[in-house]
Interface confidence: medium
Amino acid sequence: LDSPDRPWSPLTFSPAQLTVQEGENATFTCSLADIPDSFVLNWYRLSPRNQTDKLAAFQEDRIEPGRDRRFRVTRLPNGRDFHMSIVAARLNDSGIYLCGAIYLPPNTQINESPRAELSVTERTLEPPTQSPSPPPRLSGQLQGLVIGVTSVLVGVLLLLLLTWVLAAVFPRATRGACVCGSEDEPLKEGPDAAPVFTLDYGELDFQWREKTPEPPAPCAPEQTEYATIVFPGRPASPGRRASASSLQGAQPPSPEDGPGLWPL
């Protein structure tokens, strides 16, 4: 092989446009064609003032979570690709995102990927006929719940109609109608389940997130091939623009341990 003449490869960030419904996971892929042994990969959101706000980072095989744990960075097994996911996206997550690779001092180099746009749309109970992104993990359950609730409501309406007919035809029997109804097990589900669906989706999602601080990683084809290990790292500094000066303190702890001195 002659001396390699590949240029130092830029980053790619895909898809360029991503649309998800609120509550779904939004996943971008940041890819580096070449990866060094020592680097930092940052995930940014572009603020309205065109500043880069750091969401999360990957450094020396450690995930460095940001303030908001919904933003996840996962290294895929090939070492070059990184999934950058927003767990349970919110409407205000819509915006411009990018990733940046920082090759560490003394010869600091910073590469930024092209920008990508995320659109988070309002959730509708009826799923769109053509989904622009992979369905979320909950979609099947949600569909089942919607069908279930619809069935219960139809059942309740039919029962009310039947009660009304009975009341009209047998006026004396109206006193006993409620008793008969209360013994019918499926009917119990109606009043019990109904309040859940009066909740605003966002509120429901919030309660779930409070109970489970580490929601499952986004569903991906590679899911069975790798594990996301979130290490407790230093608190990230969101809103700080990556620069050579800010990196002097970001030198990773020396990975001098481990068999064979392997780095990553």
Epitope: P36, D37, F39, G79, L104, N107, S254, L261, W262, P263
Partner: antibody
């Protein structure tokens, strides 16, 4: 354009010394672990030594331990191999490389090699 | 030291035909991290070596998908689905889990 250019190879007498250099360009040298690999002409590859990104961690093949020293100057994008007490069996083409061993990085660059001949 | 043994030591294949090279390690190359530190290199006549595959299955940038790596633990294989004239050279496997890092003795691929 990514390049690794070795130099310093020469004909030297047994017991003599040499310093090999490898100048890197076109990629963030200071972020890569560097390796020296040698090859006796017509024979296989043999790992010689390795230095991590910061320069403080090094490792050597048993055959060269105590005689060779690997070092790097990240400010100059240069990798070195100081060779003392040279023996006839050190005669080989010496390559500097990245992404050889030990690494999981998704890139590997090799120089063209510099020839060291140890003969009386 | 981990000994890497390649078979066959030479191979003659016609263009368009498949080729397969085996590499056996004297001990497992699987690390507790889940990574297996096995690499494949090719050296064309009169040139420097080039890495083709890292961590058993991942191709280096620019390496055609005709090349594929497989295996686990101690037994590994490099396959070329359809050999081309340009594939001639010596193929080496190498391990990166334990110092000293070792290479196989090489397999010479000749195109008929």
């Amino acid at each position: 354009q990514v390049q690794l250019v070795e130099s310093g190879g020469d004909l030297v007498k047994p017991g003599g010394s040499l310093r090999l250099s490898c100048v890197a360009s076109g990629f963030p040298f200071s972020s890569f672990h560097m390796t020296w690999v040698r090859q006796v002409p017509g024979m296989g590859l043999q790992w010689v030594a390795y230095v991590k990104t910061g320069g403080s961690s090094t490792s050597y093949a048993d055959a060269v331990k105590g005689r060779f020293t690997i070092s790097r100057d990240n400010a100059k994008n240069t990798l070195y191999l100081h060779m003392n007490s040279l023996r006839a069996e050190d005669t080989a083409l010496y390559y500097c490389a990245t992404g050889v061993v030990p690494t999981t990085v998704a890139s590997s660059y090799w120089g063209q090699g510099t020839l060291v001949t140890v003969s009386s | 030291d981990i000994v890497m043994t390649q078979t066959p030591l030479s191979l003659s294949v016609s263009p368009g035909e498949p080729a397969s090279i085996s590499c056996k390690a004297s001990q497992s190359l699987l690390h507790s991290s889940g990574y297996t530190y096995l690499y494949w290199f090719r050296q064309k006549p009169g040139q420097s070596p080039q890495r083709l595959v890292y961590k058993v299955v991942y191709r280096d940038p620019g390496v055609p998908d005709r090349f594929s790596g497989s295996g686990s633990g101690t037994d590994f294989t490099l396959r070329i689905s359809r050999v081309e004239a340009d594939d001639a050279g010596v193929y080496y496997c190498g391990q990166g889990i334990k110092d000293p890092f070792t290479f196989g003795q090489g397999t010479k691929l000749e195109i008929k």
